[in-house]
């Protein structure tokens, strides 16, 4: 369970890939689209509000083998919209929603090498936000392999 309903901290940051492509958000036909692209030098990077929550649970309850605290994050690029995992479609989507947010909006934060981070679906352990064909997608990572695959690594810059 997530400890408390309010985040322990929040920060505004731009999100980019390991290869320094920017994650951008565009309003199209009354819905938001998410792009992974090289930004022109003069273009301002989109900022995302990251809200961090503590999650505390015994492994027997979570089923993910973790027996202590984890750091969960939600990502909101604009008011009332949050990134959400669509596990059926293996996609990452922006949805308008009210609090309390659904579990699909929560991701377990992993600190990685090179000061990168990864975002693992709360609803589907072993599945991470990643980059596929210049879009964000859900990517299953085999836990028997090293989790260092570059397409699930992101950089946060405030």
């Amino acid at each position: 369970s997530i400890t408390g309903i309010s985040p322990i901290t929040e920060s505004l940051a731009s999100l980019s890939t390991y290869n320094d492509q920017s994650i951008t958000f565009a309003l199209e036909d009354e819905s938001y689209e998410i792009y992974v692209e090289d930004l022109k030098k003069d273009k301002k990077k989109d900022k995302v509000l990251l809200s961090y929550y503590e999650s505390q649970h015994p492994s027997s309850e979570s089923g993910d083998g973790v027996d202590g605290k984890m750091l969960m994050v939600t990502l909101s690029p604009t008011k009332d919209f949050w990134l959400q995992a669509n596990n059926k479609e293996h996609s990452v989507e922006l949805h308008k929603c009210e609090k309390p947010l659904p579990d699909q909006a929560f991701f377990v934060l992993h600190n990685r090498s090179f000061n990168c981070v990864s975002f693992e679906c709360k609803t589907d352990p072993g599945v991470f936000i990643g980059v596929k064909d210049n879009h964000l997608a859900l990517i299953k990572v085999d836990y028997s392999e090293n989790l260092g695959s570059e397409n699930i690594l992101f950089k946060l810059s405030e």
Partner: antibody
């Protein structure tokens, strides 16, 4: 219970190497990174590096790059820190330490070994 | 690397006193700052994480505040067991870095 048990004190000559072990128990070993922090007599805390026990990837402080090697044995839930080309300034207590959150160091380090005193003297 | 400047390096205080320790970082670290207490011959003990969250089991007389580059640890009413050395540590990026420490001594 959740604990980190370190190997015993060592006395080494300058130029030698030392290998300190840290055995974890009471938690899911591969879900938490393991950090090494040292403290010279009467001095402050100095971060040396981290190993991810899941894949074995490492991050070392620049100061120790080329002299330090961190490894792990998942079958025994043990991590090792080897420091080579020892000099007198390496005399310190060496701690292994686990972050309070799985997968992340953002929430600080809440589990520490008792420390291993390494004395470098000719 | 992020530099950590902790002040004062030592403070003399009496039981019941309010003690404030500050930590300044060379660049913004959001709220990713931890505070530790260390007693002679012992390993450090985590007191505060994420700048202001109290670690489980730590007395409520300890509190933390700040974000960005300026942070504070406050002990509202010093107790005999609080005489120790306190360290701040940034947890924002690797390498993790520590402040130089503040020794809280009996006046």
């Amino acid at each position: 219970q959740v604990q980190l048990v370190q190997s015993g004190a060592e006395v080494k000559k300058p130029g030698a190497s030392v290998k300190v072990s840290c055995k974890a128990s009471g938690y899911t070993f591969i879900s938490y990174g393991m950090h090494w922090v040292r403290q010279a007599p009467g001095q402050g805390l100095e971060w040396m590096g981290e190993i991810n026990p899941h894949g074995g990837s490492t991050s070392y402080a620049q100061k120790f790059q080329g002299r330090v090697t961190m490894t792990r044995d998942t079958s025994t839930s043990t991590v090792y820190m080897e420091l080579s080309s020892l000099r007198s300034e390496d005399t310190a207590v060496y701690y292994c330490a686990r972050p309070s959150a799985a997968y992340s160091h953002y929430l600080g380090i809440d589990l520490w070994g008792r420390g291993t005193l390494v004395t470098v003297s000719s | 690397d992020i530099q950590m400047t902790q002040s004062p390096s030592s403070v003399s205080a009496s039981v019941g006193d309010r003690v404030t320790i500050t930590c300044r970082t060379s660049q913004g670290i959001s709220s990713w700052l931890s505070w530790y207490q260390q007693k002679p011959g012992k390993a450090p003990k985590l007191l505060i994480y994420a700048a202001s969250s109290l670690q489980s089991g730590v007395p409520s007389r300890f509190s933390g505040s700040g974000s960005g580059t300026d942070f504070t640890l406050t002990i509202s009413s010093l107790q005999p067991e609080d005489f120790a050395t306190y360290y701040c540590q940034q947890a924002h990026v690797l390498p993790l870095t520590f402040g130089g420490g503040t020794k809280v001594e009996i006046k």
